[in-house]
Interface confidence: low
Amino acid sequence: LDICSKNPCHNGGLCEEISQEVRGDVFPSYTCTCLKGYAGNHCETKCVEPLGLENGNIANSQIAASSVRVTFLGLQHWVPELARLNRAGMVNAWTPSSNDDNPWIQVNLLRRMWVTGVVTQGASRLASHEYLKAFKVAYSLNGHEFDFIHDVNKKHKEFVGNWNKNAVHVNLFETPVEAQYVRLYPTSCHTACTLRFELLGCELNGCANPLGLKNNSIPDKQITASSSYKTWGLHLFSWNPSYARLDKQGNFNAWVAGSYGNDQWLQVDLGSSKEVTGIITQGARNFGSVQFVASYKVAYSNDSANWTEYQDPRTGSSKIFPGNWDNHSHKKNLFETPILARYVRILPVAWHNRIALRLELLGC
């Protein structure tokens, strides 16, 4: 039976059969190539996910700007890393310097992604409304050569901005753009070009689905570890590996290693070989004490005996991934080269207080 004759791909996705030799037990018998603007194994997801400005998945170091406004005797810096949608506080947005005649703010997504839209918001300073009334969007694959999004007349498209300091305005692009760098250029502003924003889009390959830790589809017995910490040495108060599920709640809601050292690990058995494209980590709290993994390495295997550490493609050595800063935030790291594996191990390198992990693996 030709599996593609019933086209399992949604939204116009192209179904292609995969030969038995290539397939092994890594892939299903077909793959969907999605049209621009759609993602997921079956192109079922409309590509309008927030890319991480508001929730912090986009780090401060990924946000840059042409200039910064400094106010209030030099104490207030309206820096680009503040330009996150719905950010609160007295100084809570980006504003360029008043003498910047070509202001811009840029996000480096660290990898190529589909970008399908932008959500903008103004802010207030000394009770006055400040916001972008109009702006242009440029994008780039390398951070040097930028293309502007064009309108039907082949002119740089001018997007409609905001009308007050707090209202959120969504602009979706007519055609998704493939980009690593996205720049917003304010062209008309009220009082000052003050901005909070979010980018919308999705992963390029669509293979970044949660693999089942958070939703419990990976059973407890498939999550193991080098050791587990017991509060007061009591089994009743164990921080078991099976607790290492993203956003798990309760008094004992994470895996905590039983000893201190770089030989500790947490292992997930995915049940069968899968394409793993990323990981989301989270710390935890132990009776008020904040604990998290500050950095880690990743190892993978198909037999649980022979392990390979994920390599940094640029250096050829084991990649150390940046981890968490606190006990609750999500830190998402995507692999430049996907892993094909059944078993995945997290190898903590640095930590705060104890080695504590909640996580989700991403892939398909």
Partner: antibody
């Protein structure tokens, strides 16, 4: 024995860049669990944590100063560097570096167990 | 950020006295507390870590206690060389924060 020593310019003007060096001996920053922390103390005031660098080159900054701080290390030379830019008169202080060490894992805790003697920096126009 | 408060900014005591310095955290810090001594010349030393553990080389007349939000440093019998400013510091969560210090003087 463990020693740390801070060095850097004693006087700067506002908007300039301050680069401080912490030279240490008696330990290696490639040792798992260790790190170096920068702390400052304005004259007659309390201590303020600025930044820390772990043995694996992971870094953490005080959020209120993060946009102006950069911490780096040269493990082979036993040195850690802190850059503050641009400086302002409010950055006038004595700057200390200290070793971050890890204690018994069961406590899951670390402290600054050895400190430098401090270097005084004045920012004045 | 967690605020650390040392309500007594200066304290005067006689040689041989038992002296207690207190520190309060704005939230529960689960014993993740250190005490440091700063001599008039500026040198800083670790005395106590994890609320009650004596750092190596520190005289046994120093001790620490407390839990939750309230902690104290005790010198069982004050010596002249103990004249210094004492700081508490929480390590429960980043950013690390310090108390404003308690200056100890001899009567």
């Amino acid at each position: 024995q463990v020693t740390l020593k801070e060095s850097g310019p004693t006087v700067l003007k506002p908007t300039q860049t301050l680069t401080l060096t912490c030279s240490f001996s008696g330990f290696s920053l490639s040792t798992s669990g260790l790190g170096v922390i920068w702390i400052r103390q304005p004259s007659g005031a309390g201590l303020e944590w600025l930044a820390q660098i772990y043995w694996d080159d992971n870094k953490r900054y005080n959020p209120s100063l993060k946009s102006r701080l950069t911490i780096t290390k040269d493990t082979s030379k036993n040195q850690v560097f802190l850059t503050i830019t641009p400086v302002d008169t409010a950055d006038t202080a004595t700057y200390y570096c200290a070793r971050r060490t890890f204690y018994d894992y069961d406590e899951g805790f670390y402290a600054m167990d050895y400190w430098g003697q401090g270097t005084t920096v004045t920012v004045s126009s | 950020d967690i605020q650390m408060t040392q309500t007594t900014s200066s304290l005067s005591a006689s040689v041989g006295d038992r002296v207690t310095i207190t520190c309060r955290a704005s939230q529960d810090i689960s014993n993740y507390l250190n005490w440091y001594q700063q001599k008039p010349g500026g040198a800083i030393k670790l005395l106590i870590y994890y609320a009650s553990r004596l750092h190596s080389g520190v005289p046994s007349r120093f001790s620490g206690s407390g839990s939750g939000t309230d902690y104290s440093l005790t010198i069982s019998s004050l010596e002249p060389e103990d004249i210094a400013t004492y700081f508490c510091q929480q390590g429960n969560t980043l950013p690390l924060t310090f108390g404003q210090g308690t200056k100890l003087e001899i009567k």
